[in-house]
Amino acid sequence: FKVATPYSLYVCPEGQNVTLTCRLLGPVDKGHDVTFYKTWYRSSRGEVQTCSERRPIRNLTFQDLHLHHGGHQAANTSHDLAQRHGLESASDHHGNFSITMRNLTLLDSGLYCCLVVEIRHHHSEHRVHGAMELQVQTGKDAPSNCVVYPSSSQDSENITAA
């Protein structure tokens, strides 16, 4: 399977909410023994391998933000911890996987990575990730709403193994 990033850049005004999205593509094993671990974290540009560094999102680690469920089941973060930080990760029946960040500040700007790990009998089999950038702007140059920029077809099927 692959992970697609429909948008490579999100430009948002301060105070706005944004939903960053990744999509699971390709054949997904729906066997009873297979689940998917999905999560989000921040990373840095200029690395040899994008998304290799893992930094928290608003002090929440990738472990705090994870979802772990069957193939194309719907799921979302239920714990108060994420919601107290204005965050919610969710996954739908169609393979879309997102993180919503509320009340954006300039500090939220940066590179965000989604990670999907195929788990079989509680052990990892395959691991893929996608990357996108969030720019939070303030002042007269800031857009009134979030503006999203589609990935090139090459970028949108980011299948770099973590």
């Epitope: 009873h32 023994d33 689940t35 998917f36 671990y37 999560t39 990738f62 472990q63 705090d64 994870h66 979802l67 772990h68 469920h69 069957g70 089941q73 799921a75 239920s78 714990h79 911890l81 990670l115 790990v117 788990i119 009998h121 509680h122 052990h123 990892s124 089999e125 691991r127």
Partner: antibody, heavy 122, light 112 residues
Framework: EVQLVESGGDLVKPGGSLKLSCAAS????????MSWVRQTPDKRLEWVAT????????YYPDSVKGRFTISRDNAKNTLYLQMSSLKSEDTAMYYC???????????????WGQGSSVTVSP | DVLMTQSPLSLPVSLGDQASISCRSS???????????LEWYLQKPGQSPKLLIY???NRFSGVPDRFSGSGSGTDFTLKISRVEAEDLGVYYC?????????FGGGTKLEIK
């Protein structure tokens, strides 16, 4: 401090049912996979069941499959083991355990409760 | 099922001595993802088991460095370099590379 406290153990007749609970505290329960492990009177350990963090995936050995059901209530920070059609060979101390978890890969049981005793006897 | 066989059944040692416990699996427990999911647990009298070693050779946090794990494929060893009184109890190996997950029968470390 991570704490796991089992309860619900009892003396039960063969063919009977019993539900064990494991109350978790000191960590974000909904972020971790959990298991039940039992220890027979001869001190052998046997893995009984595992459930993933969200509760959507469970796994059992053949010895208990179809008779035992592991479940969890993340809102209540509680793990359960529903046991039915009990046999004398199910007599054991039942432990709940939390898994070390890296990206959904459960590679160790790093915290265990003190156990709950189940005796199946006529 | 993968059968885990531990030896010896009982290991009498003097305090300060080195102890070595063997665990053999009936088939390779190298997982398809490249990891070997072999763990060691210690159960002291009257207590629940405690994790010592995971993935063959990684010490769990707080476990003294006198404990070390090694091995590959089907043959694994737990070594205690200098046995202390608090190390006495029953040691179990455990594999999760193949389902069902299985424990060894245990090795009792006791004072000679």
């Amino acid at each position: 401090e991570v704490q796991l406290v089992e309860s619900g153990g009892d003396l039960v007749k063969p063919g009977g049912s019993l539900k064990l609970s494991c109350a978790a505290s000191g960590f974000t329960f909904s972020s971790y996979g959990m298991s039940w492990v039992r220890q027979t009177p001869d001190k052998r350990l046997e893995w009984v069941a595992t459930i993933n963090s969200g509760g959507s995936y469970t796994y059992y050995p053949d010895s208990v499959k179809g008779r035992f059901t592991i479940s969890r209530d993340n809102a209540k920070n509680t793990l359960y083991l529903q046991m039915s059609s009990l046999k004398s060979e199910d007599t054991a101390m039942y432990y709940c355990a939390r898994h070390e978890d890296y990206e959904g890969d459960y590679y160790a049981m790093n915290y265990w409760g003190q156990g709950s005793s189940v005796t199946v006897s006529p | 099922d993968v059968l885990m066989t531990q030896s010896p059944l009982s290991l009498p040692v003097s305090l300060g001595d080195q102890a070595s416990i063997s665990c053999r699996s009936s088939q390779s427990i190298l997982h398809s993802n490249g990891n070997t999911y072999l763990e060691w647990y210690l159960q002291k009298p009257g207590q629940s088991p405690k994790l010592l070693i995971y993935k063959v050779s990684n010490r769990f946090s707080g476990v003294p460095d006198r404990f070390s794990g090694s091995g590959s494929g089907t043959d694994f060893t737990l070594k205690i370099s200098r046995v202390e009184a608090e190390d006495l109890g029953v040691y179990y190996c455990f594999q999760t590379s193949h389902v069902p997950w299985t424990f060894g029968g245990g090795t009792k470390l006791e004072i000679k």
